[in-house]
């Protein structure tokens, strides 16, 4: 039981893409405020988003400290203007989040095709290595830095004149594919982490086609 007129948060949900991680919950506060705490399974609780009227809290700074850890958060409810007030058990009302392991669960953001270059009947397609908010030695790591070979990309490519999508895979950020001479091709990529059980695929990149300015053509 909690303080009179204070409602416990519910529907605690992790929203995370490329490790940018926000905890969301309900309800919109009426005469109450929230504080969030986060901890690893074995760690101490750290408070964030003190006495907020928002129903979300950005926990990125905490989870990027170790993306392979499993985190738990909880949302405390306090009466507005009386945040020292506690429930009958001597503690404010709170609700726990589901556990969250960023490395296994963060959504893969939509990739971007950085460039493609044709040399004769070969095309080299390069995927942008997106920067994350995960740091090592004061440097922001890229998605590839974090996931290494766990992250692969699937390239879908097709002749502009047809609809059938051929596929290629890479565990780097580059593809080298064979194409027919004199044909224009279109490309789309998808990030995949095959070892995962959830959130295995990203949405597809925007389609890029030969004959547009991202590409370069060299006849050899």
């Amino acid at each position: 039981s909690g303080t009179t007129n204070t409602v416990a948060a519910y529907n605690l949900t992790w929203k995370s893409t490329n490790f940018k991680t926000i905890l969301e919950w309900e309800p919109k506060p009426v005469n109450q405020v929230y504080t969030v705490q986060i901890s690893t399974k074995s760690g101490d609780w750290k408070s964030k988003c003190f006495y907020t009227t928002d129903t979300e809290c950005d926990l990125t700074d905490e989870i990027v400290k170790d993306v392979k850890q499993t985190y738990l958060a909880r949302v405390f409810s306090y009466p507005a203007g009386n945040v020292e007030s506690t429930g009958s058990a001597g503690e404010p009302l709170y609700e726990n989040s589901p556990e969250f392991t960023p490395y296994l669960e963060t959504n893969l953001g939509q990739p971007t095709i950085q460039s493609f270059e044709q040399v004769g009947t070969k095309v080299n397609v390069t995927v942008e290595d997106e920067r994350t908010l995960v740091r090592r030695n004061n440097t922001f790591l890229s998605l590839r830095d974090v996931f290494g070979k766990d992250l692969i990309y699937t390239l879908y490519y097709w002749k502009s004149s047809s609809s059938g999508k051929k596929t290629a895979k890479t565990n780097t950020n580059e593809f080298l594919i064979d194409v027919d001479k004199g044909e224009n091709y279109c490309f789309s990529v998808q990030a995949v982490i095959p070892s995962r059980t959830v959130n295995r695929k990203s949405t597809d990149s925007p389609v890029e086609c030969m004959g547009q300015e991202k590409g370069e053509f060299r006849e050899i």
């Epitope: 692969i152 051929k166 597809d204």
Partner: antibody, heavy 121, light 107 residues
Framework: EVQLVESGGGLVQPGGSLRLSCAAS????????IHWVRQAPGKGLEWVGY????????YYADSVKGRFTISADASKNTAYLQMNSLRAEDTAAYYC??????????????WGQGTLVTVSS | DIQMTQSPSSLSASVGDRVTITCRAS??????VAWYQQKPGKAPKLLIY???FLYSGVPSRFSGSRSGTDFTLTISSLQPEDFATYYC?????????FGQGTKVEIK
């Protein structure tokens, strides 16, 4: 438990149509890739086509291009093979299979039990 | 399309024999080769993936190897339940292609 169950096979006249279903359970199809493979009586395995159910992308074997269409309905967790303008040489057992990756190498770890399509007048 | 030439097309062997089946790719396919076992009236079953990785639940008497564009499936000691047809398959490029199959029969 992961399972793929095909249905919809049967006897059809040349030039006719048939729609095969591949109902998946134990996993969600948009997280994987679904292939269709066929096997004529007494013959080897022949790849028919694939779909990525997350985006609808498909590719077909030359032997069925323009006649067969693969689709998927994520809400039903089911993939389909629509077969039009059927010919006697399309007579076969049709299998759907789930594809996954080990690194960049694909493998097909779960297969349906197969459904027999007979094209004959 | 990449051709997978499988040999032999059939072989006769006895229980306990060492059996080797080979597949040659018409061009480089890296390690993107899988091997399947099929029994009459049944769907194929995955045995080996990525040329040499044993699929979960498959007995350790099965193994796969690669040398350039040549791929080998070996059954170290043939068991009664191993009499079946075996197929290699490449997934390196679209379309994926199968070998013609090797029927392993009882001598």
């Amino acid at each position: 438990e992961v399972q793929l169950v095909e249905s919809g096979g049967g006897l059809v006249q040349p030039g006719g149509s048939l729609r095969l279903s591949c109902a998946a359970s134990g996993f969600t199809i948009p997280a994987y890739w679904i292939h269709w493979v066929r096997q004529a009586p007494g013959k080897g395995l022949e790849w028919v086509g694939y779909i990525d159910p997350s985006n609808g992308y498909t590719y077909y074997a030359d032997s069925v291009k323009g006649r067969f269409t693969i689709s998927a309905d994520a809400s039903k967790n089911t993939a389909y093979l629509q077969m039009n303008s059927l010919r006697a040489e399309d007579t076969a057992a049709y299998y759907c299979a789930r594809a996954d990756y080990h690194g960049v190498d694909e493998y097909w770890d779960y297969w349906g039990q197969g459904t027999l399509v007979t094209v004959s007048s | 399309d990449i051709q997978m030439t499988q040999s032999p097309s059939s072989l006769s062997a006895s229980v306990g024999d060492r059996v080797t089946i080979t597949c040659r790719a018409s061009q480089d396919v890296n390690t993107a080769v899988a091997w399947y076992q099929q029994k009459p009236g049944k769907a194929p079953k995955l045995l080996i993936y990525s040329a040499s990785f044993l699929y979960s639940g498959v007995p350790s008497r099965f193994s796969g190897s690669r040398s350039g564009t040549d791929f080998t499936l070996t059954i170290s000691s043939l068991q009664p339940e191993d009499f079946a047809t075996y197929y290699c398959q490449q997934h390196y490029t679209t379309p994926p292609t199968f070998g013609q199959g090797t029927k392993v029969e009882i001598k």
